[in-house]
C-alpha cells in the first residue's frame, strides 16, 4: 500500500487581523485510522491548536464535517486572527492507539498576519527652541505586520530629508513598531507651520496614516525692539515709544527704566495676531522733560517667554528744554498697549492702569 501523505498545499497564508484564516490539510489515505491534530511550531515546545478527537478550541472549526464518511479533509478555520496567531502551523496525523501515536506531519503552513499600524503619534521638543535653531520631532507607530513599512516626514508639504528611522524588532516578530526622528530647522515664519509624519503600509490600501505636530508648540520667535521719541508736546512732555514686534509666543513682560530705575512693568495680554502668527506690542512713556536737569536715559527692557531680558535704550535730551517751577519731579508714568483678542488671559487689567 502507498504510504500515507499529509498534504498542506499552501506554504504560506497571509491574513488581515480580525479576519479568519483557513489552513488546508488533506491526507492521501483513510489508512491508518486515527485523528489529525494541528500544532503551531515544531518540536517539544509546539502549541496544540486543534485536536479533532478531544479538547475545546473556541476559535477553531473544522472546514469539512469531521463525521463525513471517508473524510480526508482536515482543514481548519481560525477566527478573529490577531498578530499573536502568526507562526507555522503543522497538520499532524496520528495512528489510533492508547494513546494515539504520532505518525506523520505535513510540511507546515506559515501564517502571517497583516496588522494595521496604529495612528502615528508625533511629539516635539519638551521645551521651545528659538527660530533659526534645529529641533527634533519623533513619530511612533505600533502593532503592524508585516515588517515592511514606509515613513515620510513633511513640513508644509515639503518632504524632509534629515530623518532617522528604526523598525523594531530587527528579527522575526508577530508585530513591529516604527520610530522616526526628523530634525527641523525653525525659521521666523514657522509659527503656522506643521510637520506631518506619514506612514504607508500594505494593510492601508494606499491610504497612508498621518500624524501631525504644529510648530507653534515648539518655536520661539524673539521680538524686535525699537525705541523712538515722538516730537515734544506743548506741555514739555516727550512721548517715547517702545515697539516690540514679530514675537511668539505672546508671553512677554516689558519694563521701562528711567536712568536705571524701574518706572513701570507691563505684561502682554490679548494681543491681535499677525498674519504669520506672531504678535506686536507698542508701549509708550510720557517723560516730563522739565522735571529733569540732565538727559534721561530711558530703557525698554523686554523679557520674552522666560528668556534673558533684551534691552533697548534711548536718551532724552533735556538741555535744550527750559525748566519750569512747580513741575513734577519725575517723569509721568503713562503707557498703553495695543489690545485685541488673544488666548492669553493670564494678566488682569491692573497691569494697564498706571498711577502718578
Amino acid at each position: 500500500e502507498e504510504e500515507l501523505q499529509v498534504i498542506q498545499p499552501e506554504k504560506s497564508v497571509s491574513v488581515a487581523a480580525g479576519d479568519s484564516a483557513t489552513l488546508n490539510c488533506t491526507v492521501s489515505s483513510l489508512i491508518p485510522v486515527g485523528p489529525i491534530q494541528w500544532f503551531r511550531g515544531a518540536g517539544p515546545g509546539r502549541e496544540l491548536i486543534y485536536n479533532l478527537k478531544e479538547g475545546h478550541f473556541p476559535r477553531v472549526t473544522a472546514v469539512s464535517d469531521p463525521t463525513k464518511r471517508n473524510n480526508m479533509d482536515f482543514s481548519i478555520r481560525i477566527s478573529n486572527i490577531t498578530p499573536a496567531d502568526a507562526g507555522t502551523y503543522y497538520c499532524v496525523k496520528f495512528r489510533k492507539g492508547s494513546p494515539d501515536v504520532e505518525l506523520k506531519s505535513g510540511a507546515g503552513t506559515e501564517l502571517s498576519v497583516r496588522a494595521k499600524p496604529s495612528a502615528p503619534v508625533v511629539s516635539g521638543p519638551a521645551v521651545r527652541a528659538t527660530a533659526e535653531h534645529t529641533v527634533s520631532f519623533t513619530c511612533e507607530s505600533h502593532g503592524f505586520s508585516p515588517r515592511d513599512i514606509t515613513l515620510k516626514w513633511f513640513k508644509n508639504g515639503n518632504e524632509l530629508s534629515d530623518v532617522q528611522t528604526n523598525v523594531d524588532p530587527a528579527g522575526k516578530s508577530v508585530s513591529y513598531s516604527i520610530r522616526s526622528t526628523a530634525r527641523v530647522l525653525l525659521t521666523r515664519r514657522d509659527v503656522h507651520s506643521q510637520v506631518i509624519c506619514e506612514v504607508a503600509h500594505v494593510t492601508l490600501q494606499g491610504d497612508p496614516l498621518r500624524g501631525t505636530a504644529n510648530l507653534s508648540e515648539a518655536i520661539r520667535v524673539p521680538p524686535f525692539l525699537e525705541v523712538t521719541q515722538q516730537s515734544m508736546r506743548a506741555d514739555n512732555q516727550v512721548n517715547v515709544t517702545c515697539q516690540v514686534t514679530k514675537f511668539y509666543p505672546q508671553r512677554l513682560q516689558l519694563t521701562w527704566l528711567e536712568n536705571g530705575n524701574v518706572s513701570r512693568t507691563e505684561m502682554a495680554s490679548a494681543l491681535p495676531e499677525n498674519k504669520d502668527g506672531t504678535y506686536n506690542w507698542t508701549s509708550w512713556l510720557l517723560v516730563n522733560v522739565s522735571a529733569h536737569r540732565d538727559d534721561v536715559k530711558l530703557t525698554c527692557q523686554v523679557e520674552h517667554d522666560g528668556q534673558p531680558a533684551v534691552n533697548k535704550s534711548f536718551s532724552v535730551k533735556v538741555s535744550a528744554h527750559p525748566k519750569e517751577q512747580g513741575s513734577n519731579t519725575a517723569a509721568e508714568n503713562t503707557g498703553t498697549n495695543e489690545r485685541g483678542s488673544s488666548d492669553y488671559k493670564d494678566d488682569d487689567d491692573k497691569h494697564h492702569h498706571h498711577h502718578h
Epitope: 483513510l30 479533532l52 478531544e54
Partner: antibody
Framework: QVQLVQSGAEVKKPGASVKVSCKAS????????INWVRQAPGQGLEWIAM????????HYNQIFKDRATLTTDTSTSTAYMELRSLRSDDTAVYYC????????????WGRGTLVTVSS | DIVLTQSPDSLAVSLGERATINCRAS??????????IFWYQQKPGQPPKLLIY???NLDSGVPDRFSGSGSGTDFTLTISSLQAEDVAVYYC????????FGQGTKLEIK
C-alpha cells in the same frame, strides 16, 4: 482514553418501551458517529442504527426504522436509543459503539446493557 | 442490502497452527480503492473488539499474528499461529453501504 458507559440492565413487559443511555468521555462527542448494535442470547451481532451527534443525522437498519429512535444530548455527551413496542425477541444485550475513523465501523464499544422483555 | 456469509460457522484448530476464516459479500464492498470490510473478535461476556479495518489493516494493539486479505467480495481473516487467548467468535462487517455483520465464526482449540 475513550470510554462509553452504558445504563444498567432493564426488565420490560411486551409492548413497553426502553431507553438505553451511553455516556461518552475521553473525546469530542460531536466529532464521531455513535452506532447501536444488539446481540440476542447466543446469537450474532445485529446493527440497529447510527447517529451523528453534531447534527443528529441518523441512519437506521430498515428492520428497526419504525421502532427505534436515536437521540443525543451534547451537553452531557450522552447518546440514547429508545426501542418501542417491545417483544420477547427484543431480549438482547444492546451495545453503543463509536466510529473513530468515519468508516461506519465500530472502534470503541460500551460494555452493553441487557434488556429483558418478559411478561 | 449487502449480505455477508461467513465460513465455516465453527472451527477447531490446534495451538500454534494457522486458522482461516472466510467472509463472502453478496456484492462488491469496494469503493474508491478501499475494501469496506472489518473484522471483530468477541470473547464470552465481553463486547466485540475491532481487529482489522478496511480488509487488511491491523487495528492498534492487535497482535501481528492476525492478518486480513481479500478484495471485492471475498475476504479472509488469518491467525498465523493460534494462541489459547484467541478462542472467541469472529465477525466480519461491511460498510460499503450501511453496516451489516456476518453471522459469526466460533473458533475453538482442537
Amino acid at each position: 482514553q475513550v470510554q462509553l458507559v452504558q445504563s444498567g440492565a432493564e426488565v420490560k413487559k411486551p409492548g413497553a418501551s426502553v431507553k438505553v443511555s451511553c455516556k461518552a468521555s475521553g473525546y469530542t462527542f460531536t466529532n464521531y458517529w455513535i452506532n447501536w448494535v444488539r446481540q440476542a442470547p447466543g446469537q450474532g451481532l445485529e446493527w440497529i442504527a447510527m447517529i451523528d451527534p453534531s447534527d443528529s443525522e441518523t441512519h437506521y437498519n430498515q428492520i428497526f426504522k419504525d421502532r427505534a429512535t436515536l437521540t443525543t444530548d451534547t451537553s452531557t455527551s450522552t447518546a440514547y436509543m429508545e426501542l418501542r413496542s417491545l417483544r420477547s425477541d427484543d431480549t438482547a444485550v444492546y451495545y453503543c459503539a463509536m466510529d473513530y475513523g468515519s468508516l461506519y465501523a465500530m472502534d470503541y464499544w460500551g460494555r452493553g446493557t441487557l434488556v429483558t422483555v418478559s411478561s | 442490502d449487502i449480505v455477508l456469509t461467513q465460513s465455516p460457522d465453527s472451527l477447531a484448530v490446534s495451538l500454534g497452527e494457522r486458522a482461516t476464516i472466510n467472509c463472502r459479500a453478496s456484492k462488491s464492498v469496494s469503493s474508491s480503492g478501499y475494501n469496506y470490510i472489518f473484522w471483530y473478535q468477541q470473547k464470552p461476556g465481553q463486547p466485540p473488539k475491532l481487529l482489522i479495518y478496511l480488509a487488511s489493516n491491523l487495528d492498534s494493539g492487535v497482535p501481528d499474528r492476525f492478518s486480513g486479505s481479500g478484495s471485492g467480495t471475498d475476504f479472509t481473516l488469518t491467525i498465523s499461529s493460534l494462541q489459547a487467548e484467541d478462542v472467541a467468535v469472529y465477525y466480519c462487517q461491511e460498510s460499503r453501504e450501511l453496516p451489516t455483520f456476518g453471522q459469526g465464526t466460533k473458533l475453538e482449540i482442537k
